[in-house]
């Protein structure tokens, strides 16, 4: 894919510095797998730099691929409390909406574990959605260097 | 974060091209769970493009978002080596100085595994130190394709 | 490493925004140890832009610092499926060709669980062709969002 | 609806053992664990284990190890509590209750009264 | 293990006036950015009912009239209005490390 002559002469960030690292908010109800989001500097060290936030998911606002990000930590785990694991616990990561661009990007079970971390390039539009499914009834660390999900974009 | 005129009329490389891989050298005494580094194209595959070494520990020259990542292996591992620990063994990567800014950045626990792995995104400043702690008793295995620690600059 | 004038006035993409992921094709035939990847939009959310694919694995076709990524998931996995291998299912990254720079990148073993994922920083020259090695007896998933590989260019 | 429905009452001779069922509907028995709780006449709840419904691992309460075991049959959707070596102090309700993992125990069987007695 | 003592014994509360019982462990059960405290109702001749799970979330068909609040050792459950269907032994229990426990239960009647 060639750069236009116009995008060669605009600033690097034009060409896409968007990039977020977003912390734990909160689950939510019992029927939602769903994890909910925050970033912000006040919050910590999580921000958003072009991607927003919309009731606690990520949506993307510039067309590229990116790195896709995600690590989870299980709040309680040990080696008894993962047993505890029925269909064992699973974390997937997907474009959630629009629902004609919906697919899962990336997934991962805890089986024996108590955290997940993976990372996948992935294109992505502007308006997508991604939603970070946590399914099972065990709950997610909110501790911020244990539970965090970021995108970054690498090119267009 | 918009970028300067001076910014947009310099080489690429004055915007941050900084970059590390590093390689395990040495665990540190038995009171110091620090993990020490080392890198350089003498030693192998490892670098160091911009960040330095003090004393083992990784410090960054050049204020940015970073992503930072680190696999570590334990050397002698099993299902019962790692299950036998009350304590499960744990990495935590995070800033160590200046003291003013000392926080835990990434932190994972090998619980029933062998090997942890993850990446996250972080605002980090000029001469901010980076140190891996691994607590516990199992020792990290010194194989480069095993363990290694590295940071990313992506962007202002 | 200093950006040439020309490098320098040349379009971004002539810098190098060579990326790739992958999808599992296939595994080899029993004495062959490798995964053969496949990419491209037609097979879904998998491209190739500057690297290529040769019999299934990864040429190289820019020199430059690469985000290496993987992510490796047992098709039929539970944590007695793992556990009753001798010799850990190994999952290996490394250069395979040219015989001359021939060594292992990364290197990942299951142990108790049935996911392995990890990412690393490492200096590939054009030619390069990267292998990914499945030791063991147990079949990775061929689902997309369970097994991908994919390289970055990040800096000359 | 979610249903825990448990075995009749047992009366027993010390040194015996008792095998109490609980069998689950309205729900994938398999997607959720199963705790065992005791409430001994005029006393509070004293959790004795769980079993892990799907791959049948079982934890037990120290104070039961050695003596209680936990069983399931997936194919009836059915959790067992077999207690041995009974003594007149474990004269309880049983309770089996369906374990909604960091949520806390969200359905209960009606519970089994055990009587031990000579 | 973790022990639950909950206070007072029994308590005896006119209707429509707020019930308070305590709760007190001997470690902290709040970790990770949640508070793993339960608390069940029990009525004569049957099986506990979960009421509010994680400290102050309320089960769902449970009236707003009760309430749970609290984090590391210290924890309420408030019945803001008592009715009289109320009437029960309520009993709070961690899931913080195995093996979970109980307080030793707290009577609510009507005065």
């Known amino acids: 894919q060639r750069l236009s002559r116009a995008q060669q002469q605009l600033p690097l960030e034009s060409l896409g510095w968007d990039i977020a690292e977003l912390q734990l908010n909160h689950t939510g109800p019992q029927q939602d797998p769903r994890l909910y989001w925050q970033g912000g500097p006040a919050l910590g060290r999580s921000f958003l730099r072009g991607p927003e936030l919309d009731k606690g998911q990520l949506r993307i606002r510039r067309d590229g691929i990116y790195m896709v990000h995600i690590q989870v930590t299980l709040a309680i785990c040990s080696s008894t409390s993962t047993s505890r694991h029925h269909h064992p616990t699973t974390l997937a990561v997907g474009i959630c909406s629009p629902a004609s661009r919906s697919i899962s990007l990336l997934r991962l079970s805890f089986h024996q574990g108590c955290t997940i971390a993976s990372q996948r390039l992935t294109p992505l539009a502007r308006g997508d959605t991604l939603c970070t499914n946590l399914t099972g009834t065990l709950l997610p660390s909110r501790n911020t260097d244990e539970t965090f999900f970021g995108v970054q974009w690498v090119r267009p | 974060q918009r970028l300067s005129r001076a910014q947009q009329q310099l080489p690429l490389e004055s915007l941050g091209w900084d970059i590390a891989e590093l390689q395990l050298n040495h665990t540190g005494p038995q009171q110091d769970p620090r993990l020490y580094w080392q890198g350089g194209p003498a030693l192998g595959r490892s670098f160091l493009r911009g960040p330095e070494l003090d004393k083992g520990q990784l410090r960054i020259r050049r204020d940015g978002i970073y992503m930072v990542h680190i696999q570590v292996t334990l050397a002698i591992c099993s299902s019962t080596s790692t299950s036998r620990h009350h304590h499960p063994t744990t990495l935590a990567v995070g800033i160590c100085s200046p003291a003013s800014r000392s926080i835990s950045l990434l932190r994972l626990s090998f619980h029933q595994g062998c090997t942890i792995a993850s990446q996250r995104l972080t605002p980090l400043a000029r001469g901010d130190t980076l140190c891996t702690n691994l607590t516990g008793t199992l020792l990290p295995s010194r194989n480069t394709d095993e363990t290694f620690f590295g940071v990313q600059w992506v962007r202002p | 490493q200093r950006l040439s004038r020309a490098q320098q006035q040349l379009p971004l993409e002539s810098l190098g925004w060579d990326i790739a992921e992958l999808q599992l094709n296939h595994t080899g035939p029993q004495q062959d140890p490798r995964l053969y990847w496949q990419g491209g939009p037609a097979l879904g959310r998998s491209f190739l832009r500057g690297p290529e694919l040769d019999k299934g694995q990864l040429r190289i076709r820019r020199d430059g610092i690469y985000m290496v990524h993987i992510q490796v998931t047992l098709a039929i996995c539970s944590s007695t499926s793992t556990s009753r291998h001798h010799h850990p299912t190994t999952l290996a990254v490394g250069i395979c060709s040219p015989a001359s720079r021939s060594i292992s990148l990364l290197r990942l073993s299951f142990h108790q669980g049935c996911t392995i994922a990890s990412q690393r920083l490492t200096p590939l020259a054009r030619g390069d062709t990267l292998c990914t090695n499945l030791t063991g007896t147990l079949l990775p998933s061929r689902n997309t969002d369970e097994t991908f590989f994919g390289v970055q260019w990040v800096r000359p | 609806q979610v249903q825990l429905v448990q075995s009749g009452a047992e009366v027993k001779k010390p040194g015996a053992s008792v095998k109490v069922s609980c069998k689950a509907s309205g729900y994938t028995f398999t997607n959720y664990g199963m705790n065992w709780v005791r409430q001994a006449p005029g006393q509070g709840l004293k959790w004795m284990g769980w079993?892990?419904?799907?791959?049948?691992?079982?934890t037990y309460a120290d104070a039961f190890k050695g003596r209680v075991t936990m069983t399931r049959d997936t194919s009836i959707s059915t959790a067992y509590m077999e207690l041995s070596r009974l003594r007149s102090d474990d004269t309880a309700v049983y309770y089996c209750?369906?374990?909604?993992?960091?949520?806390?125990?969200?359905?209960w069987g009606q519970g089994t009264t055990v009587t031990v007695s000579s | 293990d973790i022990v639950m003592t909950q206070s007072p014994d029994s308590l005896a509360v006119s209707l429509g006036e707020r019930a308070t019982i305590n709760c007190r462990a001997s470690k902290s059960v709040s970790t990770s950015g949640y508070s793993f405290m339960h608390w069940y109702q029990q009525k004569p001749g049957q099986p506990p009912k979960l009421l509010i799970y994680l400290a102050s979330n309320l089960e769902s068909g449970v009236p707003d009239r009760f309430s749970g609040s609290g984090s590391g050792t210290d924890f309420t459950l408030t019945i803001s209005s008592l009715q009289a269907e109320d009437v029960a032994v309520y009993y709070c229990?961690?899931?913080?490390?195995?093996?979970?426990?109980f307080g030793q239960g707290t009577k609510v009647e009507i005065k």
């Open positions: 209750a369906r374990d909604y993992g960091d949520y806390g125990m969200d359905y």
């Open positions: 079993i892990n419904t799907y791959t049948g691992e079982p």
């Open positions: 229990q961690h899931s913080r490390e195995v093996p979970w426990t």
